[in-house]
């Protein structure tokens, strides 16, 4: 019962997490114009992975997609890749985990098969969560770098007479959605892995070494027997890689009306 609950909860948490990763990837607010300590402007700029938008005080919002692939910063491409890999792995993981759910009967599927599928989906969720967290973190790191760079030369004067105020960008809502969603997917994956251990049928492991004496067929079995509880030394710890990178964001931007500026 506890195993079923753990598996079910893991699935639900992962489902919410993956939905969040998809939402974050599609959102336009990855970076938003920093309003603190800046002159009050009648426009509000914000940028996503796929397009950048400008919301005017008038009520108009204009968004422009990044219609180039080669002209985009490598780090933006890297973040896109990490998020898409995260979504794909998560979607496959969800598909696998549906069939692995203990409460769902599919033909005469053995518990061992369900356990393997649960473990597979769990690992997929963990990697998916890590991809999302890595992608969002890379973008955040890039924002921090660019923020301080633009702060250092915030006013670029022409002979000290005319001033051009540089638009600084700070963390957008999508980053927080991505971090939370990635974390949830990761937690869901861990729960699936824990559930897998409880699903695995009881096994007996015999580690035998045969010694052949001349003229006799005697087998010596050292170490006796070890009953596998599912938590014994037979379980392998897999190390999940943590993708890392650095980012750069340089982007630009039809109308919907929302209140903002």
């Amino acid at each position: 019962m506890a195993v079923t609950a753990c598996q079910g909860l893991g699935f639900v948490v992962s489902l919410i997490g993956i939905a969040g990763i998809i939402a974050a990837t599609c959102m336009d607010q990855w970076s938003t114009q920093d309003l603190y300590n800046n002159p009050v402007t009648a426009v509000f700029n914000y940028q996503g992975l796929w397009r950048s938008c400008v919301r005017e005080s008038s009520g108009f919002t204009e968004c422009r997609g990044y219609f180039t692939l080669l002209g985009l910063p490598a780090m933006l491409q890297a973040v896109r890749a990490l998020m898409i890999v995260g979504i794909v792995l998560g979607a496959i993981g969800l598909l696998v985990s549906i069939f692995a759910l203990k409460c769902i009967r599919i033909g005469s599927m053995e518990d061992s098969a369900k356990a393997n599928m649960t473990l597979t989906s769990g690992i997929m969720f963990i990697v998916s969560g890590l991809c999302a967290i890595a992608g969002v973190s890379v973008f955040a790191n890039m924002l921090v770098t660019n923020f301080w760079m633009s702060t250092a030369n915030m006013y670029t004067g022409m002979g000290g007479m005319v001033q051009t105020v540089q638009t600084r960008y700070t963390f957008g809502a999508a980053l927080f959605v991505g971090w939370v969603a990635g974390g949830l997917t990761l937690i869901g994956g861990v729960m699936m892995c824990i559930a897998c251990r409880g699903l695995a049928p009881e096994e007996t492991n015999y580690k035998a070494v045969s010694y052949h004496a001349s003229g006799h067929s005697v087998a010596y079995k050292p170490g006796g027997f070890k009953a596998s509880t599912g938590f014994g030394s037979n379980t392998k710890n897999k190390k999940i890689y943590d993708g890392g990178a650095r980012t750069e964001d340089e982007v630009q931007s039809y109308p919907s009306k929302h209140d903002y500026v």
Epitope: Q33, P39, V40, T41, A42, V43, N45, Q47, S52, C53, V54, E56, S57, S58, G59, F60, E62, R64, V162, Q163, T164, V165, Q166, T167, Q252, S253, K257, H258, D259, Y260, V261
Partner: antibody, heavy 118, light 113 residues
């Protein structure tokens, strides 16, 4: 057709109060930012106040901050400007304007005259 | 506050003549997000409210004759009337639509010779 009609202007003594109204029609009022602009006799226009479509953002010109209050009632398609502690320099034609692309004042009313005099 | 400086303050022209007026802002009105300049030009005739001519420094409002052209970027802007007509005699104002307060220039008065 976009139509903006201002009302509420008149003669008022210095230190007095007045409330201007602007009735809007011909567009979805709650979709657009609105502003008040005034023009003193033989002078150029002067932006007074701005209110965003859902009234989350409100800005005032330094000369009127603390004395004037802009508000809107989207259900009634009406924009207001409440003026208090009026001074002689507030004498002007007050226009209501609807913002358009580029934050331009795309549509203007015919104005209502406010005269502050003893 | 952003200071908008218009020049000349008045212009005396003859019908059919090409006219150019200038507007300078104390800070750049270019928004990096969409690479658009938030400067607007208005025309005001006596006893009437100002009428929108050009927004985003160079985009003509619908219904505005194509003899009116806006140009410029950053801090320096120009309004050009390719062939002045009698009905164009008015005061022309530029406005900063980027920073609050949304300041206007003092205007350029177009008069007939």
């Amino acid at each position: 057709e976009v139509k903006l009609v201002e009302s509420g202007g008149g003669l008022v003594q210095p230190g007095g109060s007045l409330k201007l109204s602007c009735a809007a029609s011909g567009f979805t009022f709650s979709d657009y930012g609105m502003a008040w602009v005034r023009q003193a006799p033989r002078k150029g226009p002067e932006w007074v106040a701005f209110i965003s479509n859902l009234a989350y953002s409100i800005y005032y010109a330094d000369t009127v901050t603390g004395r004037f209050t802009i508000s809107r009632e989207n259900a009634k398609n009406t924009l207001y400007l409440e003026m208090s502690s009026l001074r002689s320099e507030d004498t002007a034609m007050y226009y209501c304007a609807r913002l358009g692309r580029g934050n331009s004042f795309a549509y203007w009313g015919q104005g209502t005259l406010v005269t502050v005099s003893a | 506050d952003i200071v908008m400086t218009q020049s000349p303050s008045s212009l005396t022209v003859t019908a059919g003549e090409k006219v150019t007026m200038s507007c300078k802002s104390s800070q750049s009105l270019l928004n990096s997000g969409n690479q658009k300049n938030y400067l607007t030009w208005y025309q005001q005739k006596p006893g009437q409210p100002p009428k929108l001519l050009i927004y985003w420094a160079s985009t003509r409002e619908s219904g505005v004759p194509d003899r009116f052209t806006g140009s410029g970027s950053g801090t320096d802007f120009t309004l050009t009337i390719s062939s002045v007509q009698a009905e164009d005699l008015a005061v022309y104002y530029c406005q900063n639509n980027y920073y609050y307060p949304l300041t206007f220039g003092a205007g350029t008065k177009l008069e007939l010779k």
